[in-house]
């Protein structure tokens, strides 16, 4: 039994890191393998993660971690019984994928303005809480070409757009994702989408 693709890990910079790897053949990850991990810290202890299958030869492990700080470094040991298959390390702050925003809501009762709000996925004491920026994706269910991205570079988790920038009388969907420039993170997954019917009063045309 050998590792074909070494484990690569990403952290949500809060409490979970996800590691994925591939073996050289079909493997029952949960029965044959264990990923041991430990924070390099005087008061830490070793933990064991039981991996799950992720395709025939692929394995994935969700590591429960202490609150992350930038200096953290974890040792990782992948075992098959008594055999050490791979040894490595992982700095969560260097491989961050933020959590997805939640509670996306479209408020359509503000005159002819659409107000989209969502929740920051981090608690106020987490470093990323004040460092997230967002991308909002709005698209038409009727017209695949009607697809747009709004970059929200301020900290407030909201976006205002004129309803008239979208077509009236049809349904739209929106979703939002996050990233943090400070740690050069990847984008989060998209939030669940929310749907609304866009309607507004056309301006009176004078002839």
């Amino acid at each position: 039994m050998k590792v074909l693709q070494e484990p690569t890990c990403v952290s949500d910079y809060m409490s979970i890191s996800t590691c994925e790897w591939k073996m050289n053949g079909p493997t029952n990850c949960s029965t044959e393998l264990r990923l041991l991990y430990q924070l390099v810290f005087l008061l830490s202890e070793a933990h064991t993660c039981i991996p799950e299958n992720n395709g025939g030869a692929g394995c994935v492990c969700h590591l429960l971690m202490d609150d992350v700080v930038s200096a953290d470094n974890y040792t990782l040991d992948l075992w098959a019984g008594q055999q050490l298959l791979w040894k490595g390390s992982f700095k969560p702050s260097e491989h961050v994928k933020p959590r997805a925003p939640g509670n996306l809501t479209v408020h359509t009762n503000v005159s002819d303005t659409l107000l989209l709000t969502w929740s920051n996925p981090y608690p106020p004491d987490n470093y990323l809480y004040n460092h997230l920026t967002y991308a909002v994706n709005i698209w038409s269910e009727n017209d695949p070409a009607d697809f747009r991205i709004y970059n929200v570079t301020y900290l407030e988790p909201s976006l205002r757009i004129a309803a008239s920038t979208l077509k009236s009388g049809i349904s739209y969907r929106a979703r939002v994702r996050a990233w943090a420039q400070c740690y050069n993170t990847t984008w989060s997954e998209w939030s669940p989408s929310t749907k609304w019917h866009n309607s507004y009063r056309e301006p009176f045309e004078q002839h």
Epitope: V40, F41, L42, L43, S44, D66, A71, P123, D125
Partner: antibody, heavy 115, light 109 residues
Framework: EVQLVQSGGGLVHPGGSLRLSCAGS????????MFWVRQAPGKGLEWVSG???????SYADSVKGRFTISRDNAKNSLYLQMNSLRAEDMAVYYC?????????WGQGTLVTVSS | EIVLTQSPGTLSLSPGERATLSCRAS???????LAWYQQKPGQAPRLLIY???SRATGIPDRFSGSGSGTDFTLTISRLEPEDFAVYYC??????????FGQGTKVEIK
């Protein structure tokens, strides 16, 4: 807002015992290492003890064998049991959250050791 | 055990002046594990700088940290009245634990 609220200081005779408490709020207590740091009157800061999220502990040589740090994650609380107290243990004791450094501190509680 | 020595013991300056505080370690310290604190009379210490040069949340940008190896510096670019206090450096070591310097008092001249 992260808060650490301390209680349990007071006057004790040499050789006596005292238990300090620290209640945390505004953060996930169970995912953070916790510490005690003290400051003798007019002196500098001295690290006393620390406890990891899994219960691993460490002590300064000056208190080893006399002090015991513990935590109750269900109550978001940190404790320091101090036995065989000496005159040199007299100080303001601070609880703190942290790891390699201490990012949040309690208000401090004075422990006076005097006959 | 790593010993941290701060200098000077006392720094007498006027508001608006630049303050430079030194922290020297008896052996090499990882920059990731070097921090600075401010303490005012009757108050708990407050984290200013961690990782030798990163400002903690809410700390004004007049505070900056630098250095590596055995020599570290805290600089206050322009002293405000509220900056007069005692400053401590602190390091963490995987075997020896946590140690503080003896402190530098920044007082009004």
């Amino acid at each position: 807002e992260v808060q650490l609220v301390q209680s349990g200081g007071g006057l004790v005779h040499p050789g006596g015992s005292l238990r300090l408490s620290c209640a945390g709020s505004g953060f996930t207590f169970s995912r953070n290492a916790m510490f005690w740091v003290r400051q003798a009157p007019g002196k500098g800061l001295e690290w006393v003890s620390g406890i990891g999220t899994g219960g691993a502990t460490s002590y300064a040589d000056s208190v080893k064998g006399r002090f015991t740090i513990s935590r109750d994650n269900a109550k978001n609380s940190l404790y320091l049991q101090m036995n065989s107290l000496r005159a040199e243990d007299m100080a303001v004791y601070y609880c703190a959250r942290g790891r390699y450094y201490f990012d949040y501190w309690g208000q401090g509680t004075l422990v006076t050791v005097s006959s | 055990e790593i010993v941290l020595t701060q200098s000077p013991g006392t720094l007498s300056l006027s508001p608006g002046e630049r303050a430079t505080l030194s922290c020297r370690a008896s052996q090499s310290v990882s920059s990731s594990y070097l921090a600075w604190y401010q303490q005012k009379p009757g108050q708990a210490p407050r984290l200013l700088i961690y990782g030798a040069s990163s400002r903690a949340t809410g700390i004004p940008d007049r505070f900056s940290g630098s250095g590596s190896g055995t020599d570290f510096t805290l600089t206050i670019s322009r002293l405000e009245p509220e900056d007069f206090a005692v400053y401590y450096c602190q390091q963490y070591d995987h075997s020896a634990g946590w140690t503080f310097g003896q402190g530098t008092k920044v007082e009004i001249k």
